[in-house]
Amino acid sequence: RKIPKVGHTFFQKPESCPPVPGGSMKLDIGIINENQRVSMSRNIESRSTSPWNYTVTWDPNRYPSEVVQAQCRNLGCINAQGKEDISMNSVPIQQETLVVRRKHQGCSVSFQLEKVLVTVGCTCVTPVIHHVQ
Amino acid sequence: GITIPRNPGCPNSEDKNFPRTVMVNLNIHNRNTNTNPKRSSDYYNRSTSPWNLHRNEDPERYPSVIWEAKCRHLGCINADGNVDYHMNSVPIQQEILVLRREPPHCPNSFRLEKILVSVGCTCVTPIVHHVA
């Protein structure tokens, strides 16, 4: 999948654009909003009716190297009595993000953008049952 | 920066950390092509904390379209299909990395940007603080 080129109708390529070799793009990995922090409601992963745990995955050849993945704790959902309701399903909610992958080929190094699917948390859903004849 | 294990036979000139600016291939390595959550899952309707999806479009960003979730109710849907206000629907937020055209309007020059998106909603037990 390629980054879409800027449409001629909307943009005029400014003179200030840096020269870039064909088939590649220049990427500054100094992150804008680097210090932005998620202000999620307090420990919703434990208070949810579809609670989840977090696991940190670490890869030194990826930027950012740390990616946090959520896993639903239960198959069902927690009811008002604190018991698992097995007629409901805890399901993972996922979101795509971009990472930069560093690849070593012999002594040369190349960089590749990659889409990564992150499990963000879980939600409780009513199951759908299909009877296949 | 990030320390990279170096091939011991390689010249020692290479920086162990990710450089500030890199040249990357225009092709994104990606198996997850379905970026429209309306098509990829129907959770937003079936959840006990359902949400609506709003399209956020910005041609200076890649991906240019990001879907934002907004919880439909303050409470959660109970077994009878009614809103139970003893429970709370809350957004699940996630920081994601996107590409921002920099300088603006340039076709092949980008900078990574961290943005906060609401991905969906989950139903939680409210915390009640009694202030004397």
Epitope: L75, V91, H130 | -
Partner: nanobody, 118 residues
Framework: EVQLVESGGGLVQPGGSLRLSCAAS????????MAWVRQAPGKGLEWVSS????????NYADSVKGRFTISRDNAKNTLHLQMNSLKPEDTALYYC???????????GGQGTQVTVSS
């Protein structure tokens, strides 16, 4: 396409045991949650038990907890339900179901009849 064939049902006295099996084909068994659901005469479907893709998570309806045990063999694409201390109220048609992580379930078999009676 999901294909599920249940077996192992029968007539048993109260307090007796049965082991139900479900042979699965047509899909990647190890990627699906699996479950047993049952339907008593004149009643709706009831979730009995389910298991995660690797079998490390299981859950049970309160009515069968401590008596029934669900298990899966991913190498053989088979799901089992060990039913002990059976009661007359366990009488039902038992179906095996395959579910995606998104909570979409398929039941494909004819079910297997379990009758608990003296």
């Amino acid at each position: 396409e999901v294909q599920l064939v249940e077996s192992g049902g029968g007539l048993v006295q109260p307090g007796g045991s049965l082991r139900l099996s479900c042979a699965a084909s047509g899909f990647t068994f190890s990627s699906y949650r699996m479950a047993w659901v049952r339907q008593a005469p004149g009643k709706g479907l009831e979730w009995v038990s389910s298991t995660s893709t690797g079998g490390e998570m299981t859950n049970y309806a309160d009515s069968v907890k401590g008596r029934f045990t669900i298990s899966r063999d991913n190498a053989k694409n088979t799901l089992h339900l060990q039913m002990n201390s059976l009661k007359p109220e366990d009488t039902a048609l038992y179906y095996c179901a395959a579910g995606t992580s998104a909570g979409h379930w398929s039941t494909g078999g004819q079910g297997t009849q379990v009758t608990v009676s003296s």
